[in-house]
């Protein structure tokens, strides 16, 4: 079955710092999404090959793509407190694939002592059952930070 | 068992708008993508509109800037703001479930939309 | 645009019969494509996905195949509750577009 590798799962990085979140399948996709997770989940680009990307409002000017849809590295730039949270990659082929979830969390300058990641993926068991369609879970509250505001989700 | 009830049809002079409503149950609203096809009075289907799970949005130019498709993860209803609407929008429109970007799995029995002065 | 074409607009058969509803695509749409059942009152499901997967609840008599561009849906023991249109639909790429239907009726 078709699988996401994503990868880290989790980093901690100081406001304005940028993220690398690579999305690695074995192909045959119709594109990827990467989303970001909490209970209203919040697409945050989709990709597809030949296609110009959709990227949402808050994230404009400060997404950038490297690779193709079957191994593809988003790097997100000038991170904000608000963007801390658990972010998935959705591959979209036959059928959902999704990948494990990247932890996310974007501190204080002078507080990145106070929070670290650990070495554990996101635990999948605080996952809930996938959609019927779906290779692996959809991960709606992987986190267990607080959700950060929401932002618009306009393409 | 899944279900999903259009409603908000009518009447309606071109030029006008409406606000279509999709009551959805028996799924987890917030985990899927959502769609609205039309019937045309000559039982063409026509994809009018898509939303992810994660809130992006996509239309056919048919459609675009005059169509807008939103949904309300919290009550468990997804919409269709019509506006500048022409005698061609006249259709059926149906909301469906769109378990993989486009393949639709569960559709709704449909709310009747007939544009005409 | 990716155009969806079912020649066949109406077809005939009695009970029993098999048959085969034939769908093209103006472009290869590799093997993204949807097989959904109208009756005449409306009602819409889905029937096959991804060329030949059967969607849950359907019954096996209903198969679905091709590849490139020539798509099939195939009734292997025409019963009376088949009696519907049948559209074809690709979701390879947006907008997602529909064939013209192809009603099937009782001789």
């Known amino acids: 079955a078709q699988e996401v590798q994503q990868s880290p799962h989790c980093t901690t990085v100081p406001v304005g710092a940028s993220v690398n979140i690579t999305c690695s399948t074995s192909g045959g996709l119709r594109g990827i999404y990467l989303r970001q997770l909490g209970p209203q989940p919040q697409d945050i680009i989709y990709y597809e090959d030949g296609v110009v990307p959709t990227t949402d409002r808050r994230f404009r000017g400060r997404i950038d793509f490297s690779g193709s849809q079957d191994n593809l590295t988003i790097t997100m730039h000038r991170l904000q407190l608000s963007d801390t949270g658990t972010y998935t990659c959705q591959a979209i082929t036959e059928v959902n694939v999704y990948g494990s979830g990247t932890l996310v969390l974007v501190t204080e300058e002078q507080s990145q002592g106070w929070h670290r990641c650990s070495d554990a993926p996101p635990r999948a068991s605080a996952l809930p059952a996938p959609p019927t369609g779906s290779a692996l879970p959809d991960p709606q509250t992987a986190s267990a930070l607080p959700d950060p505001p929401a932002a618009s989700a306009l393409p | 068992e899944v279900q999903l009830v259009e409603s908000g049809g009518g009447l309606v002079k071109p030029g006008g708008s409406l606000k279509l409503s999709c009551a959805a149950s028996g799924l987890t609203f917030s985990s899927y993508a959502m769609s609205w096809v039309r019937q045309t009075p000559e039982k063409r289907l026509e994809w009018v509109a898509s939303?992810?799970?994660?809130?992006?949005?996509y239309y056919p130019d048919s459609v675009k800037g005059r169509f807008t498709i939103s949904r309300d993860n919290a009550r468990n209803i997804l919409y269709l703001q019509m506006s500048s609407l022409r005698s061609e929008d006249t259709a059926m429109y149906y909301c469906?479930?769109?378990?993989?970007?486009?393949?639709?799995?569960?559709w709704g029995a449909g709310t009747t939309v007939t544009v005409s002065s | 645009d990716i155009q969806m074409t079912q020649t066949t607009s109406s077809l005939s058969a009695s009970l029993g019969d098999r048959v085969t509803i034939s769908c093209s695509a103006s472009q290869g749409i590799s093997n993204y494509l949807n097989w959904y059942q109208q009756k005449p009152d409306g009602t819409v499901k889905l029937l096959i996905y991804y060329t030949s997967s059967l969607h849950s609840g359907v019954p096996s008599r209903f198969s679905g195949s091709g590849s490139g561009t020539d798509y099939s849906l195939t009734i292997s023991n025409l019963e009376p509750e088949d009696i519907a249109t049948y559209y074809c639909?690709?979701?390879?790429?947006?907008?997602?577009?529909f064939g013209g239907g192809t009603k099937l009726e009782i001789k």
């Open positions: 639909q690709q979701y390879s790429k947006l907008p997602y577009t």
């Open positions: 469906a479930r769109d378990e993989v970007r486009g393949y639709l799995d569960v």
């Open positions: 939303i992810s799970s994660g809130g992006f949005t």
